[in-house]
Structures are given as structure tokens and as C-alpha cells.
Amino acid sequence: CDLPQTHSLGNRRALILLAQMGRISPFSCLKDRHDFGLPQEEFDGNQFQKTQAISVLHEMIQQTFNLFSTEDSSAAWEQSLLEKFSTELYQQLNNLEACVIQEVGMEETPLMNEDSILAVRKYFQRITLYLTEKKYSPCAWEVVRAEIMRSLSFSTNLQKILRRKD
């Protein structure tokens, strides 16, 4: 399954929108900084097959979409930017979904890398718990916004590797 070029463009658009969503200076939130343990090894496109990489990408985007679809998120961000950002993520999910469905239909498809899926899920658990502990404060959301920009950048790199594999 070949991810369309528009998928990468969508990812870049999502990153731009996320950058625009920043409301407060990151420097005023330095005390709230947190290491969420982004599982960078899961974004090494050389370590597993394309099908597995697409499943990991899908999980990453789906968890990001869910995170920014909560009521707490709606209260934290400018509505029109949040809606545009969610729309970009949704489009990416559709592209990735079509790819995964295509691969699921092929009997020779290897088992999915369940530990990679779990690593992504645990990463977002840490983010969720951080927001809960910080009571969804503006600075907590700013820290999370910066972190998601970082994770989306990693997923953009993974997509580049995947396209080279085509």
C-alpha cells in the first residue's frame, strides 16, 4: 500500500496548525517540563516491516486525535484551529486505515508488532496522567502541545522512510 504524497502534506499541515495553537510562551512553563519517554525506537522505519510501521503510525495518530477530542482539550485551544487540526488528523487516519485494511486482507501479512502498539499506548497514558495530575492547566497543555509536535515530527520521518521502501 502506497501512502499518498498528500498524507505527508497533511502531516506537515497538522504540525503547522499545532504550532499556531500555542497560546502562551513555552518559557513561562519551564517548571512544568516533563519527559514523557517518546518511544523513538518505534519510529525507526528500518527495524520492522512496512505493514507493522503503518499500524504504529495509525496508533500514534489515533491516540493524538483522541487526546485532542476531549472536552478538556476543547476548553484549552482556539476552536477553529483545533477543528482544523483534528480534520487533518482524521484525514491521515483515513489514509492509514485504508492501508492497514489492505494489509489485513493479505494472508501472508506478518503478525503486527504488538509491543510497538503497546509502547505508543503507554506513551499516551503517561501524557494523559500528566494532564490529570496538573489538572489540565494551561502550562500542562502547552507542554503536551510541544511534546505532540515532537512525536508528529518523528512520525513524519517514519513516513519518509516508508516511502523510500516503496
Epitope: N66, V100, L129, T132
Partner: antibody
Framework: QVQLVQSGAEVKKPGASVKVSCKAS????????MHWVRQAPGQGLEWMGE????????IYAQKFQGRVTMTRDTSTSTVYMELSSLRSEDTAVYYC????????????WGQGTLVTVSS | EIVLTQSPATLSLSPGERATLSCSAG???????LYWYQQKPGQAPRLLIY???NLASGIPARFSGSGSGTDFTLTISSLEPEDFAVYYC?????????FGQGTKLEIK
Amino acid sequence: QVQLVQSGAEVKKPGASVKVSCKASGYTFTNYWMHWVRQAPGQGLEWMGEINPSHGRTIYAQKFQGRVTMTRDTSTSTVYMELSSLRSEDTAVYYCARGGLGPAWFAYWGQGTLVTVSS
Amino acid sequence: EIVLTQSPATLSLSPGERATLSCSAGSSVDSSYLYWYQQKPGQAPRLLIYSTSNLASGIPARFSGSGSGTDFTLTISSLEPEDFAVYYCHQWSSYPFTFGQGTKLEIK
């Protein structure tokens, strides 16, 4: 509000298969993995596996690999769990439970479906 | 597979008393992925505590959780009649996800 409604009780003979359904409502069906957990009479809870309704990928517990098949129908927001080669030890209440994160992990359960395997 | 062992298997106490339920993991479990559920006869399990010590929505403050590594505890500070049920600890730190065998809390 989130609701998971399961199909009714089943009685099956050893060696047969059973297919239990779980219809979801009150949230975007494709956004959350759905899990299956079973409970034999008077026993504890046992995780069987999960399915991502968005694309249909599954992760099964090794114990059930080869005997369990989880599928979904996005048009009806329903997930299915089929267990084959049934034996008496498979007599249990089967639950679907929605995944999520933080306080949403297994916060929503179906009412359970009793499957009885008896000759 | 991470085996969760709960103790005691049965705990007999009276309303108003303090209940302490233990969950011991066969290997270390990150506290973020350790949960507690309550189950009453004929009902589905109900989420009580997530990530070791956080109270789920609608759960009374008399319930609390603690622990780390391989030892986790659920405490009910003063038992109410509706608290008598079976309690399960659960981990999703690694596949396959597992549950403890349960602790039955019964009226003395």
C-alpha cells in the same frame, strides 16, 4: 452515554463454535480498541484479546491464538468474538470492554454473555 | 506473562472497619498500568482505581490505592454495606494483560 450491548446466552456442544456480538453506542466506534475478557463460573477474569475497530487489526492472548477470531462491522458499530473447538472449560461469561487511557481504560463493559458448553 | 496474586482470597469484616487488600506481581509493573476493579454478583466489573492511586469517576473517597514495583494495595477506610464484593487488580504493562484471582470481601 457510552453503552456496550452484548448478544444473548448460548448453549453449545463440545467441538462447536460460538460467536458473541457487542454493539457499541455513545462514542465514535472506530476511535477505541475493544477487548474481550471472560470469566468462568466462580472464577476470576481472563483477558482474551483486542481489536481495533478502525482497521480490524487484532492482538490475541497466546492461550487463545488459533481458536479465537475477533472481527468488527463498522456499519453497525459492532464487534464480534468467535471461539472455536469449544470444550467444557470454555463455559464462562464473556465480556466486551472498551479500551482507552487513564480513567477510560476498561471503564465501560458489556453486560456479559453466558456461553455454556455441554454435551 | 505477569502473574498477579491477590491476598487474602477472602476477607471477612464488619461495616465501619478498614479493609486492606493486597496484589503482588510476579515481575515489576509500572504503577501507571495497575488498576483495581470491583465486581458484584451478576454484574460486570466496575473501575475503581486507575494507575495505582487515582480514583475513578464517581468512586467514594473511602477507597484508595498505593504501591509500586511488585506490591500494590487497595484500602477501604471504613466499609459500607455496598462495598462487600469481589475486588480484582489488573495490569496492562505487558501482554498478555492479566488480572489477579480476586479477593472476596464478605460481611463478618
